[in-house]
């Protein structure tokens, strides 16, 4: 049964919202999709979760959520916010998740984000952000996940990322980024997942991924790369790599020499004609290899050290004979 305290909690539920105890004597409040144009005023001080997404909120006043010191998750996605003032999140000392996606923000709300020391997850995707100020994330020392996809960025906000040494996953997909400079992510030593798909990336600095010592997933699909991304060679923990749907014509010798942990490589929908014979050596975790239409391949690839392939597809090549060792190399 419910305790007397939970009854008191539920009496602090705003009109039309759905509220329930969260099991820790705190309150989960769902005010989503109610056509609200402003924040509800009579929120319980014991609120831990507040969902205000899919409303018509167009502005936040400074300090609109006073005393919500237990609030851990705030959802403001799918509103009409164009600007978030300084002090909008003042006093939210426990805030771990902030969702601001699907609004009309043009800049990262730098001043509003200051001092959110507990924040672990920040969603800014699907806005109109074209500029990320250098110091905008400087106080977010606990941030683990950052969504900046589906915005209007034309370059990597290199300086802004320098303070995010705890970041584990980030997406910059669906922007208009055209180049990744050297050391673009140089301080993100904890980053495990990086999504850069659906941009306009045509060039990579040769050291652009240096510093990403924990990276396991890199998605460069749907870009304008016309050369193999040799900068991946410092990614010694990389497990999943995507660069399909680019304009890459060749995969060089020793292409994945620094990536012995690779399990999956997606590179279909590239006009690949040449593949270095040693390109796929020493990939003991690789399970699937598909090479379609590589017309300049005349020799069967040397798969020394790539002993766990379960599927190998080679079409459109000009291989006239198979090496005698091919059956020894494959399981």
């Amino acid at each position: 049964g419910s305790s007397p305290r939970s009854g008191v909690l539920l009496r602090g539920c705003p009109t039309h919202c759905h509220c329930e105890p969260d099991g820790r004597m705190l309150l989960r409040v769902d005010c989503s999709d109610l056509g609200l144009s402003e924040l509800p005023s009579n929120l319980s001080v014991f609120t831990s979760y507040l969902d205000l997404s899919m409303n018509n909120i167009s502005q936040l006043l400074p300090n609109p959520l006073p005393s919500l010191r237990f609030l851990e998750e705030l959802r403001l996605a799918g509103n009409a916010l164009t600007y978030i003032p300084k002090g909008a999140f003042t006093g939210l000392y426990s805030l771990k998740v902030l969702m601001l996606q699907n609004n009309q923000l043009r800049h990262v709300p730098t001043e509003a984000l200051q001092n959110l020391r507990s924040l672990q997850s920040l969603r800014l995707d699907a806005n109109h952000i074209s500029y990320v100020p250098p110091s905008c994330f400087s106080g977010l020392h606990s941030l683990r996940h950052l969504w900046l996809d589906d915005n209007a960025l034309t370059e990597i906000p290199v300086q802004a990322f320098r303070s995010l040494s705890a970041l584990q996953a980030m997406t910059l997909a669906l922007n208009k980024i055209h180049h990744i400079p050297d050391y673009a992510f140089g301080n993100l030593s904890s980053l495990v997942v990086l999504h850069l798909h659906n941009n306009r990336i045509h060039s990579l600095g040769k050291k652009c991924f240096d510093g990403l010592h924990s990276l396991e997933t890199l998605d460069l699909n749907y870009n304008n790369l016309d050369e193999f991304p040799t900068a991946i060679r410092t990614l010694s923990n990389l497990k999943e790599l995507g660069f399909h749907s680019n304009n890459i014509r060749s995969i060089p010798e020793k292409a994945f020499v620094g990536n012995p942990s690779l399990i999956t490589i997606h590179f279909y929908d590239n006009p690949i004609q040449f593949v270095g014979r040693s390109a796929f050596q020493h990939l003991p975790e690789l399970r699937t290899l598909t090479l379609n239409g590589a017309s300049q391949i005349t020799e069967f690839p040397d798969l020394t050290g790539t002993a766990n392939l379960e599927s190998l597809t080679l079409t459109g090549a000009q291989i006239s004979s198979l090496p005698q060792t091919v059956c020894n190399q494959l399981p």
Epitope: P134, E155, I156, V158, Q159, R162, P181, D182, Y183, A184, G186, N187, K206, K207, D210, G211, H213, T230, R233, T234, L235, S236, E253, K254, V257, G258
Partner: antibody, heavy 118, light 111 residues
Framework: EVQLVQSGAEVKKPGASVKVSCKAS????????IEWVRQAPGQGLEWIGE????????DYNEKFKVRVTITSDTSTSTVYLELSSLRSEDTAVYYC???????????WGQGTLVTVSS | DIVMTQSPDSLAVSLGERATINCRAS??????????MHWYQQKPGQPPKLLIY???NLESGVPDRFSGSGSGTDFTLTISSLQAEDVAVYYC?????????FGQGTKVEIK
């Protein structure tokens, strides 16, 4: 603990070649660039070139390009600097260093003195 | 090539006093908001030791009396309170573009 241990001192005649080694330990060898820097007696520091171990990725100072080769051996975690057509002005201490945060040189070998004398 | 010029060539400072070394690059070493300028300390018979990276970031384990500042072409290394063990030659270095280049060095001594 990250360590870079270089080979011992060499004395060479003008026109000869020298090969200096740098053995790395304490980190993932293929994930960091190794730089070579030299220091003539009583002089400053001069960058020679760099390699990403295990790959064919190298860059050289144009001044040394025709005389220098930097290679690596991942099986022993060792990088090599070979300098040919030695002349007296190549007398220097040769250092290897790891390219760390943003390319700064965060760990250095102890240095190898190469003396070129007839 | 980018030329790095340090000043002064040598510096004598009393123990506990401030030491300031300047480094000027012949062109900007800034890229995407980062200044690709680093500072090293070298004591006799030893390899250089990294003190500061990206103009102002203190390398792990380096005492906080060392600090760096500047951007573009002009940079400064400051030792706020000189200690006996700080006697050394200090070098700035840029890795904005190949070839990476060093300043000529500044010798710091005790007055």
């Amino acid at each position: 603990e990250v360590q870079l241990v270089q080979s011992g001192a060499e004395v060479k005649k003008p026109g000869a070649s020298v090969k200096v080694s740098c053995k790395a330990s304490g980190y993932t060898f293929s994930a960091y660039w190794i730089e070579w820097v030299r220091q003539a007696p009583g002089q400053g520091l001069e960058w020679i070139g760099e390699i990403l171990p295990g790959s064919d990725s190298t860059d050289y100072n144009e001044k040394f390009k025709v005389r220098v080769t930097i290679t690596s051996d991942t099986s022993t975690s060792t990088v090599y600097l070979e300098l040919s057509s030695l002349r007296s002005e190549d007398t220097a201490v040769y250092y290897c260093a790891r390219g760390g945060h943003y390319g700064s040189l965060d760990y250095w070998g102890q240095g190898t003195l190469v003396t070129v004398s007839s | 090539d980018i030329v790095m010029t340090q000043s002064p060539d040598s510096l004598a400072v009393s123990l506990g006093e401030r030491a300031t070394i300047n480094c000027r690059a012949s062109e900007s070493v800034d890229n995407y908001g980062n200044s690709f300028m680093h500072w090293y300390q070298q004591k006799p018979g030893q390899p250089p030791k990294l003190l500061i990276y990206l103009a102002s970031n203190l390398e792990s384990g380096v005492p906080d009396r060392f600090s760096g500042s500047g951007s573009g072409t002009d940079f400064t290394l400051t030792i706020s309170s000189l200690q006996a063990e700080d006697v050394a030659v200090y070098y700035c270095q840029q890795n904005y573009e190949d070839p990476f280049t060093f300043g000529q060095g500044t010798k710091v001594e005790i007055k």
